[in-house]
């Protein structure tokens, strides 16, 4: 509409609906068109009800913004009034019959310029030009830089700052190279950048696992070491392990039909329970084999433990013991059976005695008043324990017994009960199986140690301590600590071992002082079926070596430091070690694997037992050898 | 798992003679103790002696002695209760039932499905 | 021959804990009596559920336990469901013979 015509209209409008009131079609002769009519009117209404009569009504609240009814009336033809734009995103607005339209500002778009124009995201200007970050903002953008870059001129493109050249000490002691967007302070290989002191420092590589087991650091570069308590050595690349190999295999097979009673060290091998009706007395069948000649074989007790019955082996015969209600009794008798050999054992619980058969030949009866163990209401409840005692019952033995014992069971038949119970439990557990073939002697599996406290300090000698040791051996694997003193302070002031020779199938044998050597008794065929024999005598003016074997040793004034050292050890407190070290650093030592194979060691005169030991590992058999792998046409 | 089946409902004339089985899977038959339970009709559980599968002893409730007789095949894991000189009122389901533990007489923990045996004439 | 009593019949509701009793005509039911709780379902089916007083069977729910209250045995359901409606009967061992009770039929609405 041109503006004469639209002042026309507001002169008929104060006319006709403001001096005086208007119907609808008196108000349609003032617009000349329905769709302005039906605009108007019923806002017009609005108006009158909020100012007629002075009335206050709840419409008048959307009138507030008039003063009078002239002002109220005159606004509502103008589209544009109240303003429907967005504020912020308009730039004009155009009033049109019962409509309006509103022009926008560069960045803003929609029917009232609401909607931002994310020029960021425009397809036609990627990026909105910008190099490197867009910022999109309401009604327009603005392109920034990472950190490390700076804004050109045409504030769109981005260029890297040289911090090494803006800042020369940025590295301190390192060397500062730039990068895109930032700069590295490099160190030489080794060493890393500290950002606190701004210099190079040591890397510790062992803590980023670059060695495969063991590793020592040092400024600038690191050390791998294998771990020879686990069979390892360290392969050609310097970092990984490989296995120290085996030079005499053995024949480890065994059978979950054969019971291993030395499965512990200390405690019992097997417990089982039982309840039974009183018909059955206590009865115990096995086949036995051993080449121990002291421990327990089962011990049998009441639920109350006020009646117990021990089968034991003492000086390599039968022994029994037992206490109850009415009597209290020990038997030993029958041939010696600690000979390798099966043989059959029974222990049965007749009405007045306790008969012991060996092969099925009596060879003691025990009289007894009343029953071994008192029913409880018709059944017989009694526990029995294989190979130990169930807690410290030593002061309630007639006769004490080192419980160790080093054998096998098989054939067993408890409580009348066959091998129900025992075999469930032992079919499923390798350690309680029993090798098929053994020797007599002690094997070492190449997996702990046997301790000992020894004295070796002898009041009637004026040399004051002295060592003599006597070694049979028959190793398996070619590297190991036979034997070791270790002091109080983790160092291992002398040590017998073998280690693989560099010539072909053969060992050396190394004595060494701490981590020096200090006698070498190079290649020797020791892992064969025969048993090799080394005899020697140490004190602190010497070390001779008795058996005669070609030798390689350190200078005399060499030998006497390291005795010196030796000596210094002994006059304090040394625990000796059989087959392996205890928890001393890899480094203390030339060799640290556990040696692997049978020994018996005599020191000083004395036969080392190992049911005698302060502490043994469970896998050390104190007794019993492994047979050498015999060689089949098939195998 | 632990299963006893039991063989199948028996009929038989006042005088004779009946054999029920009762075949166990899941464990180690000898290990265990089996009972003997009958039920009859409209009565409570009467129980009538065990069996020990290793050894074959056995031990029957006074009532049953001289008419029951307990056995076992261990190469088929199979337990037998018979029954001689039938009445009528030894109508009942008969059930075996193992001890739940291995040499732990006296601990009923697992049930046959029953036998019924009905003594007719 | 001794003679075992049982509650005839218990009612209990679901969450709720119920105890069945087991006394023996021969004195106070002792552990000597190795106390056994069977469950009876329908179509005759049996499942141990306690022996020797108080050791629950393999695969038994937690909520039943056997006890010794006074001089009686006793089957304790804590917290019983609907599946656990069924009759239960306990045998108690005498000397070289089980006698069992007469069951409690227990109902859990």
């Known amino acids: 509409a041109n503006s004469m015509l639209e002042e026309t209209k507001q002169g008929n409008l104060e006319r006709e609906c403001i001096e005086e009131l208007c119907n609808k079609e008196e108000a349609r002769e003032v617009f000349e068109n329905d769709p302005e009519t039906d605009y108007f009117y019923p806002k017009y209404l609005v108006c009158l009800r909020s100012f007629q009569s002075g009335l206050f009504t709840a419409a008048r609240q959307s009138t507030d913004a008039y003063p009078d009814l002239r002002s109220c009336v005159n606004a509502i033809p103008d589209q544009c009034s109240p303003l429907p734009c967005n504020e912020d995103g308009y730039m004009s607005c155009k009033d049109g019959k019962a409509s309006f339209t509103c022009t926008c500002k560069p960045g803003w778009q929609g029917e009232k310029c609401e909607f931002d124009i994310n020029e960021c995201k425009d397809p036609s200007n990627i990026n909105g030009g910008c190099s490197q970050i867009c910022d999109n903002t309401p009604g327009s953008y603005h392109c920034s830089c990472k950190s490390g870059f700076v804004m050109l001129s045409n504030k769109k493109d981005c260029k890297d700052v040289d911090e090494c050249s803006l800042k020369p000490n940025m590295c301190g002691t390192a060397v500062c190279k730039n990068i895109p967007g930032d700069f590295e302070c490099e160190c030489p290989e080794g060493y890393r950048y500290n950002l606190k002191s701004k210099s190079c420092e040591d890397v510790d590589e062992c803590s980023e696992n670059m060695c495969a087991q063991l590793c020592v650091n040092y400024p600038g570069g690191y050390t791998c070491y294998c771990d020879g308590k686990k069979g390892f050595k360290l392969a050609q690349d310097q970092k990984s392990c490989e296995a120290v190999s085996v030079c005499l295999p053995l024949n480890l097979d065994t059978k979950y039909e054969l019971l291993y009673l030395a499965e512990q060290f200390a405690g019992v091998v097997l417990y089982l329970k039982f309840r039974l009706p009183e018909i059955s007395r206590f009865s115990a069948e096995f086949d036995f084999r051993t080449y121990d000649s002291q421990g327990v074989i089962l011990y049998a007790e009441s639920i109350d433990h006020s009646a117990w019955l021990l089968i034991a082996l003492r000086g390599g015969k039968i022994e029994v013991q037992l206490k109850n209600e009415h009597t209290s009794k020990i038997t030993t008798g029958g041939d010696i059976i600690n000979n390798g050999l099966w043989n059959m054992v029974s222990v049965e619980e007749l009405e007045h005695s306790i008969s012991i058969k060996i092969a099925k030949e009596a060879v003691m009866d025990i009289n007894k008043p009343g029953p071994l163990f008192k029913p409880e209401n018709g059944l017989l409840e009694t526990k029995v324990y294989f190979a130990g005692f169930p807690r410290k019952v030593e002061s309630e033995l007639i006769k004490p017994i080192n419980p160790r014992l080093d054998g096998c069971i098989r054939s067993w038949n408890l409580m009348k009960q066959g091998a129900s119970g025992i075999k469930e439990i032992i079919q499923e557990k390798q350690n309680k199986h029993c090798l098929v073939t053994v020797e007599k002697g002690s094997y070492y599996p190449g997996s702990g140690i046997a301790e000992f406290h020894i004295d070796y300090n002898n009041g009637s000698n004026a040399e004051g301590w002295h060592i003599n040791v006597t070694l049979n051996i028959r190793p398996s694997m070619g590297t190991g600590v036979m034997l070791a003193l270790v002091s109080s302070n983790n160092t291992v002031p002398f040590a017998v071992s073998l280690v693989d020779s560099t010539s072909e199938k053969s060992q050396d044998i190394v004595i060494s002082v701490e981590n020096t050597v200090i006698y070498r008794i190079q290649a020797l065929s020791l892992c064969s079926n025969q048993r090799s024999h080394l005899e020697f005598r140490v004190n602190r003016n010497n070390l001779e070596l008795l058996t005669p074997l070609k030798i390689e040793t350190i200078s005399q004034e060499e030998l006497q430091t390291q005795l010196a050292i030796l000596d210094k050890a002994m006059k304090g407190k040394v625990a000796t070690y059989l087959g392996g070290l205890p928890d001393v650093p890899f480094s203390a030592t030339p060799v640290n694997a556990f040696y692997n194979g049978c020994m018996e060691v005599n020191i000083n005169g004395v036969e080392l037992d190992l049911d005698e030991a302060i502490s043994k590992h469970n896998d050390i058999r104190a007794h019993s050898c492994p047979s050498v792998w015999k060689k089949t046409k098939n195998s | 798992q632990v299963q006893l089946v039991q063989s199948g409902a028996e009929v038989k004339k006042p005088g004779a003679s009946v054999k029920v089985s009762c075949k166990s899977s899941?464990?180690?038959?000898?290990?265990?103790?089996m009972h003997w339970v009958r039920q009859a009709p409209g009565q409570g559980l009467e129980w009538m002696g065990w069996?020990?599968?290793?050894?074959?002893?056995?031990n029957y409730a006074q009532k049953f002695q001289g008419r029951v007789t307990m056995t076992r095949d261990t190469s088929i894991s199979t337990a037998y209760m018979e029954m001689s000189r039938l009445r009528s009122d030894d109508t009942a389901v008969y059930y075996c039932?193992?001890?739940?533990?291995?040499?732990?007489?006296?601990?009923?923990?697992?049930w046959g499905q029953g036998t019924l045996v009905t003594v007719s004439s | 021959q001794a003679v075992v009593t049982q509650e005839s019949a218990l009612t209990t509701s679901p969450g709720e804990t119920v105890t069945l009793t087991c006394r023996s005509s021969?004195?106070?039911?002792?552990?000597?009596?190795?106390a056994n709780w069977v469950q009876e379902k329908p179509d005759h089916l049996f499942t141990g559920l306690i022996g020797?007083?108080?050791n629950r069977a393999p695969g038994v729910p937690a909520r039943f336990s056997g006890s010794l209250i006074g001089d009686k045995a006793a089957l304790t359901i804590t917290g019983a469901q609907t599946e656990d409606e069924a009759i239960y009967f306990c045998?108690?061992?005498?000397?070289?013979?089980?006698?069992f009770g007469g069951g409690t039929k227990l109902t859990v609405l």
């Open positions: 039932a193992r001890d739940s533990q291995i040499l732990w007489f006296g601990e009923l923990g697992y």
């Open positions: 899941g464990h180690t038959f000898t290990g265990y103790y």
């Open positions: 069996i020990n599968p290793n050894s074959g002893d056995t």
């Open positions: 021969t004195g106070a039911v002792t552990a000597s009596n190795y």
């Open positions: 020797s007083t108080n």
């Open positions: 045998a108690l061992w005498y000397s070289d013979h089980f006698v």
